[in-house]
């Protein structure tokens, strides 16, 4: 039967190693059998390079490229073979579809005066050029009440925010996750961050009197 | 130690056809960009084809185009410049040298890093 | 086509001096930061070229360091430090950006 594309390859890059297409097609297809993405950087002598796509769901191929370090001025050309059929072309410049990597590590800390500290990892070594250019976006959330979260954008370099106890309901679990964002490169939010929990012991002022 | 020993330079009639060959030794020649460069008598360089590392694409000078081809054999550490329709002005030493690293996503650049010693083409009635 | 423009196309050097050769590009050759794909040749009397610099300023193999290259976009120059009789003949630079590559004209080095 005829291979189609239902909705065309939409990719992202972390700009650092690696950039990802993913497209949905019009019937359920084992993606690594069927299909391959070609992938050739736009500069004088490179090679072809063929990606081998995996399913995410039945009928959606995700593909994962390595990519050199990135430069703005880098452009893939990009072919959608199924067989010596040609499916789908079309071009890619990572600095222009970026999607940070996820931050890491997020770990709360009790910190002076009843506060928490929340930290976490910048995804990126510091001689990428996205290292000093991520804000976050910290959601935390009341585990036993899904009207109690709060989120906070973190527009300072640090990887950190300090959360006071007496904002949160004592007594309760609360969870943090983190996602990241390039605001110069007008990139997409990063995936979460894997959730922390911890219980938030703080005693409201009235409970000492 | 890095070598390179271009041979089939003659003396041709125009129209004629040439073919010139490249023996490379010293380092992993499929990883790398091959270039022709010719240099007419007593004038400059003139870059003529490249070809990347696996054959897969080339790349010619205009006044050349349609006329040569430069490929490659990776089993045998050979480069290729198959020259047809000759003309006068085609009259060079032509060398080859290494260019750029093309196995990674990138090319790595270093330049024309390391030249043949260049074989005569004479086109002449 | 990138068009390579050197000056002066010959010089004349006593022993000891500095010689500067100057080559302008009609579109930039960074690509990106550090970057610039231009190289320079010297090719001596009866020889075949050799590489002096890759990417603007970066020394090739064996190159001493009295050969530096310095510039950025579209202006590059090449400074041959404490010239020797051997530095003797002509200097190319070439661009490697995009097809076609192109050289410029050449600059004859002549030790006084």
């Known amino acids: 039967g005829s291979v189609k594309v239902l909705h065309e390859p939409s990719c992202f890059s972390d700009y650092i190693s690696t950039s990802v297409c993913q497209w949905k097609m019009d019937h359920p297809t084992n993606c690594s059998a069927e299909l391959r993405l070609s992938y050739q950087l736009d500069f004088m002598g490179s090679e072809n390079h063929t990606c081998v796509p995996e399913n995410r769901e039945d009928s959606v191929c995700v593909c994962s490229m390595p990519i050199d370090d990135a430069v703005e001025a880098d452009v893939y050309q990009l072919d959608l073979w199924a067989g010596q059929q040609l499916l789908w072309s079309g071009s890619f410049q990572p600095s222009k579809h970026v999607k940070p990597r996820t931050p890491g590590n997020l770990t709360v800390h009790p910190n002076i005066s009843h506060t928490w500290l929340l930290m976490w990892t910048n995804p990126y070594p510091t001689e990428n050029h996205l290292h000093s250019e991520l804000t976050y976006m910290v959601n935390v959330s009341n585990d036993n009440d899904p009207e109690d979260f709060k989120v906070y954008n973190v527009t300072y370099m640090g990887p950190t925010l300090r959360l006071a106890a007496s904002t949160l309901k004592s007594g309760a679990s609360y969870s943090a996750r983190v996602r990241a964002w390039a605001q110069t490169y007008n990139s997409t939010w990063s995936d979460w961050s894997p959730s922390t929990t911890w219980l938030n012991y703080y005693e409201p002022w009235e409970q000492h009197l | 130690e890095v070598q390179l020993v271009e041979s089939g330079g003659d003396l041709v009639k125009p129209g004629g056809s040439l073919r010139l060959s490249c023996v490379a030794s010293?380092?992993?020649?499929?990883?790398?960009?091959m270039t022709w460069v010719r240099q007419a008598p007593g004038k400059g360089l003139q870059w003529v084809s490249l070809i990347n590392g696996t054959g897969g694409k080339t790349y010619y000078a205009d006044a050349v185009k349609g006329r040569f081809t430069i490929s490659r054999d990776n089993a045998k550490n050979t480069l290729y410049l198959q020259m047809n329709s000759l003309r006068a002005e085609d009259t060079a030493v032509y060398y080859c040298a290494v260019d750029r690293l093309t196995k990674t996503i990138r090319p790595q650049y270093y330049g024309l890093w390391a030249w043949g010693q260049g074989t005569l083409v004479t086109v002449s009635s | 086509d990138i068009v390579m423009t050197q000056t002066p196309l010959s010089l004349s050097v006593s022993p000891g001096e500095t010689a500067s050769i100057s080559c302008r590009s009609s579109q930039s050759l960074l690509y990106s930061i550090g970057y610039n794909y231009l190289d320079w040749y010297l090719q001596k009397p009866g020889q075949s070229p050799q590489g002096l610099i890759y990417?603007?300023?970066k020394r090739a193999s064996g190159v001493p360091d009295r050969f530096s290259g310095s510039g950025s976009g579209t202006d590059f120059t090449l400074r041959i430090s404490r010239v020797e009789a051997n530095d003797t003949g002509v200097y190319y630079c070439m661009q490697g950006l995009q097809s076609p590559l192109t050289f410029g004209q050449g600059t004859k080095l002549e030790i006084k």
């Open positions: 010293g380092f992993t020649f499929r990883d790398y960009a």
């Open positions: 990417l603007g300023s």
